[in-house]
């Protein structure tokens, strides 16, 4: 985790005047001026009543304000004389001392209160040196750190109990630990005091750093008893238009000319082709003039434009139908969703003075008129001997975004003689067990002189067709079966060829014994 912070509540090292702590009895601890390792003047306390047994010398610090701290650490620097190096002393010589504390809501202690004993004082630990020294040695300084808590009152006193040691208390520092404010996972966590116990984990709520957004919640970090952060929960990440910087402690705006479309830890990217940004922190780059993005295009796709016109439109006219074919546009606008539309215009009048208008709805386009993927269309049901203009438009996914109409290539054609239109309804004139006599009206648009009619018929149960021709607009079908149903269709023929068959019509022969229906007098010649 991050390095712990230590805040001092009291440190004798920086006191140059008298400490004036309270000692009991007065013959015990004695305040002495001395020097530390760096030869700085310091105030120390010494005790060395080793020649007398049953020592109980207490020393109490001044009142130390707690500052909402729950656990206090005490760093003690001291030297202890080796009992073995002191001649002629009783067996009561000690090389340890005891550390106590006493909590109070104000500086209430006096020379006699609280009583100089464990309870009311709370024992922290018995402090033993790592090294003691003999008379011949220079004093070896021991450093010990102990902690205590939880604390609840306004402040406390430290107390030291000597029970027969020869020692010097060189410095006392009371301090507490806290976790330093930190940034982790693009979130900011405030300076946080450690808990009451060494094992305590104190939750610190986090907030996203500027230009970051939460990706998982709650945002928290745990401050352990050593003032170190651990177990991050939740995270933030850089918002759109911002990228990580300074080891995940900043989210920096994308500089002009770059963008970032999605939140996350990715970097800003240069604008895709045909797009730009004019300000920092862009989440999308805007398209250059005449370039667009389709609704389905992502922010990281290039801006594209409309296709150029199709090339090389070829028409192949056959009577009142034609096939149009063309080649791909030279410029697809940077897209692969090219489609074609075919616009049909019927022209009236001669030469340059002709006016053209949209074609009738009955004109048929195969496979379709709009949204063609193939570069070929079959157009039928045009009028004979009529001039038409066909515009083949090239469109793509951004054509709808452009204020201009689609680019197109045009071709002018004139239709030829057409085959006759469909024969309208057939009428039954008479039927017998073996024949049907039928008639029909000529086509609405014969488109020329009708040469003859062809009739296709089959028995519905069998389904095998036969054909007969007739010069008239009537016919008698012979060789049929009685009580049978027949489907009949007729088509007309001119020099331009056969027209469409009429819609299937159904007729039934009578039973063998049944009499034929009455014959119509009228048989219309062609």
């Amino acid at each position: 985790g991050c390095r712990a912070l230590e805040e001092t509540l009291m440190d004798t090292k920086w006191v140059t005047s008298e400490l004036a702590w309270t000692s009991h009895p007065e013959s015990g601890w004695e305040e002495v001026s001395g020097y530390d390792e760096a030869m700085n003047p310091i105030r120390t306390y010494q005790v060395c009543n080793v020649r007398e047994s049953s020592q109980n010398n207490w020393l109490r610090t001044g009142f130390i304000w707690r500052r909402d701290v729950q656990r206090v650490y005490v760093e003690l620097k001291f030297t202890v004389r080796d009992c073995n190096s002191i001649p002629n002393i009783p067996g009561s010589c000690k090389e340890t001392f005891n550390l106590f504390y006493y909590e109070a809501d104000s500086d209430v202690a006096s020379a006699s209160s609280p009583f100089w004993m464990e309870n009311p004082y709370v024992k922290v630990d018995t402090i033993a040196p790592d090294e003691s020294f003999s008379r011949l040695d220079a004093g070896r300084v021991n450093t010990k750190v102990r902690s205590f808590g939880p604390l609840s009152k306004a402040g406390f006193y430290l107390a030291f109990q000597d029970q027969g040691a020869c020692m010097s208390l060189i410095s006392v520092r009371a301090f507490y630990k806290k976790c330093a404010s930190t940034t982790a996972g693009f979130a900011l966590f405030p300076e946080t005091l450690t808990g009451a116990e060494p094992t305590s984990l104190v939750i610190a709520p986090g907030t996203c750093i500027p230009n970051a957004v939460e990706v998982s919640v709650p945002l928290k970090l745990y401050c352990n008893g050593d003032g170190e952060w651990m177990v991050p929960v939740g995270a933030c990440t850089c918002a759109t238009g911002h990228e990580p910087a300074a080891k995940e402690s900043q989210c920096r705006p994308c500089p002009p000319g770059s963008y970032k479309a999605k939140q996350g830890e990715g970097p800003c990217l240069p604008c895709p082709p045909n797009s730009r940004t004019t300000s920092p922190a862009a989440s999308i780059c805007t398209c250059h003039n005449n370039f667009y993005r389709a609704d389905s295009d992502s922010a990281d796709s290039a801006c594209t434009t409309v296709p150029s016109p199709p090339r090389g439109v070829i028409s192949n006219v056959n009577e009142t139908s034609l096939i149009l074919e063309w080649s791909e546009p030279r410029d697809l606008g940077g897209r692969d969703d090219l489609l074609y539309n075919v616009i049909c215009k019927k022209c009236h009048g001669a030469g340059g003075a002709s006016a053209c208008s949209r074609c009738d709805d009955n004109v048929e386009f195969v496979p379709r008129q709009l949204g063609l993927t193939e570069r070929r269309v079959h157009i039928s049901h045009l009028l004979a001997h009529t001039r038409y203009t066909f515009e083949v438009q090239a469109v793509n996914g951004v054509s709808g975004k452009s204020p201009l109409p689609p680019r197109y290539a045009a071709v002018n054609i004139t239709t030829n003689q057409a085959a006759p239109s469909e024969v309208p309804t057939l009428r039954l004139h008479s039927s017998s067990g073996s024949s049907l006599t039928l008639s029909w009206a000529p086509p609405e648009r014969p488109n020329g002189v009708i040469l003859d009619y062809e009739m296709k018929y089959f028995e519905k149960s069998e389904g095998i067709a036969s054909t007969v021709t007739s010069q008239m607009n009537s016919v008698q079908l012979d060789g049929l079966r009685p009580d049978a149903r027949y489907v009949v269709q007729v088509r007309a023929r001119t020099v331009a060829g056969y027209g469409q068959y009429s819609r299937p019509a159904e007729f039934e022969t009578t039973s063998e014994r049944g009499s034929g229906a009455q014959q119509l007098q009228e048989q219309l010649p062609l």
Partner: antibody, heavy 113, light 112 residues
Amino acid sequence: EVQLQQSGAELVMPGASVKLSCKASGYTFTSYYIHWVKQRPGQGLEWIGEIDPSDSYTNYNQKFKGKATLTVDKSSSTAYMQLSSLTSEDSAVYYCTRGITNWGQGTTLTVSS
Amino acid sequence: DIVMTQAAFSNPVTLGTSASISCRSSKSLLHSNGITYLYWYLQKPGQSLQLLIYRMSNLASGVPDRFSGSGSGTAFTLRISRVEAEDVGVYYCMQHLEYPFTFGGGTKLEIK
């Protein structure tokens, strides 16, 4: 292209009924009768009956009257044959045909407990 | 009902030679309109039936002209002029003169 798509194989209990289907495409459904034919291994082919899809007029083989019922649904260009009171004798392949020219692929019916 | 009779097996034929399959009806299939309502079908192994000949002697659409049909009112013949391996199967005759329409028992074409 004329196509007659028949329903998949059926395994049914004796005494039950079953409805076989025949979906027509590629032609004017109402212009041709639909015939139904039964084929049992080693028993040859038997004509069951025919139906006119335009008005549901039917002709049945006397042998299959009460056994087979022919119907059509013009909206979906589908012909149906319902077989009732099934016995092991009804286990066979059943074909539908357009007129007598185009045949479906057949539906295998197995009647077994 | 009109009974249609066929031999169960043909005489074994060699590929490239001609084969004939016969069919008899218990009643004349010649209608007063001059049409003989006799039809020939082939059922290849694992397949449905395919129309070969209609009205005794007319070749159905898409059928090779190696196949031909002939006969009188009650005796009918299907002829294959040059038998090919793909012609293997069961050949059925059917009458469509009167209800109920009936089929022959089928003749299996045997290759030597």
